[in-house]
Interface confidence: low
Amino acid sequence: MALFSAQSPYINPIIPFTGPIQGGLQEGLQVTLQGTTKSFAQRFVVNFQNSFNGNDIAFHFNPRFEEGGYVVCNTKQNGQWGPEERKMQMPFQKGMPFELCFLVQRSEFKVMVNKKFFVQYQHRVPYHLVDTIAVSGCLKLSFITFQNSAAPVQHVFSTLQFSQPVQFPRTPKGRKQKTQNFRPAHQAPMAQTTIHMVHSTPGQMFSTPGIPPVVYPTPAYTIPFYTPIPNGLYPSKSIMISGNVLPDATRFHINLRCGGDIAFHLNPRFNENAVVRNTQINNSWGQEERSLLGRMPFSRGQSFSVWIICEGHCFKVAVNGQHMCEYYHRLKNLQDINTLEVAGDIQLTHVQT
């Protein structure tokens, strides 16, 4: 499942913690808590509730270490608790780190602990009334993140912001091309594609195929943006990044990373009117490449779409639908190139890995 950030995370929140869920709960919202239970823990609580007063709790999730360990789930309406649902297992260990993930679905909450399914809890009250998360008890939290699952892949490609099909040269200069044509976006391998998008209505994403999503006026991506590339790169794998260059931009960069190395560094520099490409291995940069087929394709204050296609011998880069350059692989272990980083003076609107 692809995810995009629904709101800024809460970092190291002090317990007891109560904080707003921006926009309330919506189908597809995933709330993840990472923390550590205290070594003397007896119980802790995560509440999804309406407002800060605690009288209306849509989902009360309450692990209890006593009596062998179990978890209580319940709902409180108008100050009254309903019948408890008890799961007679304890997925948490005292004094140990954990990752607790709540996924809001149409009819229930799904709860994962340390990436394993633990329990589901049927909605007893409309989940869209929930606008607050509250955490208390014997634990310490590192963060609470909020992410929305992205659009179904089959509907996504009609929304890419290319004004025309991407134009790439048929054959690289001086080389025979192994693959004659670029696979167009709608034929990209589905199973490997992750879309990170910003939508105005996460609960109803792409109900009408072909209508582009409305982008929030404020950036929902944090910059620098990091995301894994599932299974790394391989020939025909494509990556698409769309965004807006800030009006006072100096530079930004797109890095395809291989551990601590940067296999491909794409670095538009507005103060130099150049697009620098390079590779960093063992913290050392190689020879820069700056040649362009045409003019500098990025402009301050303008939107852009960058499409990077990984081929067997090179990366091909298109900007706003036009081929910009090729970059021959210097790091050949493509499957180990598994992280995308985008940083600099831009606002991101779409990322597809």
């Epitope: 995370p9 550590t36 944090t222 910059i223 990091y226 100096t250």
Partner: antibody, heavy 123, light 107 residues
Framework: EVQLVESGGGLVQPGGSLRLSCAAS????????IHWVRQAPGKGLEWVAR????????YYADSVKGRFTISADTSKNTAYLQMNSLRAEDTAVYYC????????????????WGQGTLVTVSS | DIQMTQSPSSLSASVGDRVTITCRAS??????VAWYQQKPGKAPKLLIY???SLYSGVPSRFSGSRSGTDFTLTISSLQPEDFATYYC?????????FGQGTKVEIK
Amino acid sequence: EVQLVESGGGLVQPGGSLRLSCAASGFTFHSYWIHWVRQAPGKGLEWVARIDSSKFGTYYADSVKGRFTISADTSKNTAYLQMNSLRAEDTAVYYCARSYIDYPVSPAVFDYWGQGTLVTVSS
Amino acid sequence: DIQMTQSPSSLSASVGDRVTITCRASQSVSSAVAWYQQKPGKAPKLLIYSASSLYSGVPSRFSGSRSGTDFTLTISSLQPEDFATYYCQQVYFSPYTFGQGTKVEIK
């Protein structure tokens, strides 16, 4: 409780070696980068090196490149700084710090630090 | 490397004063700037990240702002426990460089 505890500091002669350790507890080690930052007596902070404890990617400041090596042992939740060819100017308190990989804006924001360990390079 | 030029290097102020410390980056670092407080013999403590986001547990009298490549830490009403040295740090490009520090002393 999140804790970072440095050890291994001491007095060493110029050209000598020292290995610092940073024992981490109270958090998921592989979700963080571990950094070493040093502070010479009466001076400011200088970032030295960092390791991505999930992928073991490493970066170094130019001043230590080729002499220092950062590493990590996830089974022990411990990061190390192997310091070779030590010079007088490496004398400092060495701190380890963590930074969450998906921290908003940048994964190099240091939210927890150890208490520091003093390294003195002198003959 | 990106240089972070911090000013002033020291300042004297009284309890209740409004204190402003600035840092200028030698090139664009987006909003990837953090501010730390350090007291003698202690490790630094995070105050501000992302140029203007207040770190959890830090009093609201601390604030940060950005204007291009200029970054500002403001203490709206100085308290006795705020007398310390403050550092800015850019966390945009490795190496993650710090400013040279500003020592806030009692007038």
